[in-house]
């Protein structure tokens, strides 16, 4: 039994780091493998992660962490029984994938303005809380070409757009994702999408 693709890990910079790897053949990850991880700290102890299958030869493990700070470094040991298959390390702050924003809501009752709001996925005491920026994706269910991205570079989790920038009388969907420049993170997953019917009063044409 050998590791074909070494584990790569990403952290949500809160409580979970996810490591993925591939074996050289079909493997029952949860019965055959264990990933041991330990914070490099005088008084820490090793924790065991039981991996799950992620495709035939792929495995994934969700490492539980109390919290994360920039200096944290973890040692990782991948075991198959008594055999050490791979040894490595992981610094969560250097491999951050933020949590996806939640509770995306479209408020259509503001005069001819669409107000999109969502929730910051981090609690206020987490470092990323004040460092997230967002991308909002809006698309038409009827017209695949009607697809747009709005970059929200301010901290407030909201976006206002004129309803007239979208077509009237058709249904739209929106979703939002996050990233943090300070840690050069990857983008989060997209939030679940939300749907609304776009309608607004056309202004009277003056002749």
């Amino acid at each position: 039994m050998k590791v074909l693709q070494e584990p790569t890990c990403v952290s949500d910079y809160m409580s979970i780091s996810t490591c993925e790897w591939k074996m050289n053949g079909p493997t029952n990850c949860s019965t055959e493998l264990r990933l041991l991880y330990q914070l490099v700290f005088l008084l820490s102890e090793a924790h065991t992660c039981i991996p799950e299958n992620n495709g035939g030869a792929g495995c994934v493990c969700h490492l539980l962490m109390d919290d994360v700070v920039a200096a944290d470094n973890y040692t990782l040991d991948l075991w198959a029984g008594q055999q050490l298959l791979w040894k490595g390390s992981f610094k969560p702050s250097e491999h951050v994938k933020p949590r996806a924003p939640g509770n995306l809501t479209v408020h259509t009752n503001v005069s001819d303005t669409l107000l999109l709001t969502w929730s910051n996925p981090y609690p206020p005491d987490n470092y990323l809380y004040n460092h997230l920026t967002y991308a909002v994706n809006i698309w038409s269910e009827n017209d695949p070409a009607d697809f747009r991205i709005y970059n929200v570079t301010y901290l407030e989790p909201s976006l206002r757009i004129a309803a007239s920038t979208l077509k009237s009388g058709i249904s739209y969907r929106a979703r939002v994702r996050a990233w943090a420049q300070c840690y050069n993170t990857t983008w989060s997953e997209w939030s679940p999408s939300t749907k609304w019917h776009n309608s607004y009063r056309e202004p009277f044409e003056q002749h």
Partner: antibody
């Protein structure tokens, strides 16, 4: 709410022994390393000893090595410090502290006086 | 003598910004993170800053920490009378397999 309550302090003669206890509540005791820190009257803080969550690894300050023994009973949520061959310079308030990178919660302390 | 050196005293007037330093000796390893504790008169110490610059929940953002090499600093802005206390820095020393604490700094709020 995290609470740490020390007990077992008192007056002891030089060369004598005492056993301090620290009853923990409000958190999962078995998941946290613990430590003892002391403070002599009018002096600064001095780290004494620390123990990992399972008790597998133990550390002592040079000043107490060979005389003090730290231990824990995770089933009772209690930390202990057995102090033998006590000296006058061990006179201090002894604090029990939870460890999460630093000493993030402290008890109110128990006074140990070593005097003849 | 502590391997972490702090000034024995510091002072400031209400509203001022005060900084307390904590210096490791030249041979002190710079890999560890610094922590800061506040001890109000007659009470147990309380964690103020951990891992160089992180504040536990409940600690006002008037308190901030920073690290440079083997030294660290605690800054208190908008000084208040209730900040009058002893402040200690500390760090895990992996060469000693133990925890080292500075001698403490007594902060006095004047006037």
């Amino acid at each position: 709410e995290v609470q740490l309550l020390e007990s077992g302090g008192g007056l002891v003669q030089p060369g004598g022994s005492l056993r301090l206890s620290c009853a923990a509540s409000g958190f999962t005791f078995s998941r946290h390393a613990m430590a003892w820190v002391r403070q002599a009257p009018g002096k600064g803080l001095e780290w004494v000893s620390a123990i990992t969550s399972s008790g597998r690894s133990i550390y002592y300050a040079d000043s107490v090595k060979g005389r003090f023994t730290i231990s824990r009973d995770n089933s009772k949520n209690t930390l202990y410090l057995q102090m033998n061959s006590l000296r006058a310079e061990d006179t201090a308030v002894y604090y029990c502290a939870r460890v999460h990178r630093a000493f993030d919660y402290w008890g109110q302390g128990t006074l140990v006086t070593v005097s003849s | 003598q502590s391997v972490l050196t702090q000034p024995p005293s510091a002072s400031g007037t209400p509203g001022q910004r005060v900084t307390i330093s904590c210096s490791g000796s030249p041979l002190f390893p710079d890999s560890g993170s610094f922590n800061w504790y506040q001890q109000l008169p007659g009470t147990a110490p309380k964690l103020l800053i951990y891992a160089d610059s992180h504040r536990p929940s409940g600690v006002p953002d008037r308190f901030s920490g920073s690290k440079s090499g083997t030294s660290a600093s605690l800054a208190i802005s908008g000084l208040r009378s209730e900040d009058e206390a002893d402040y200690y820095c500390g760090t895990w020393d992996y060469s000693l397999s133990g925890y080292v604490l500075g001698g403490g700094t007594k902060l006095t709020v004047l006037g």
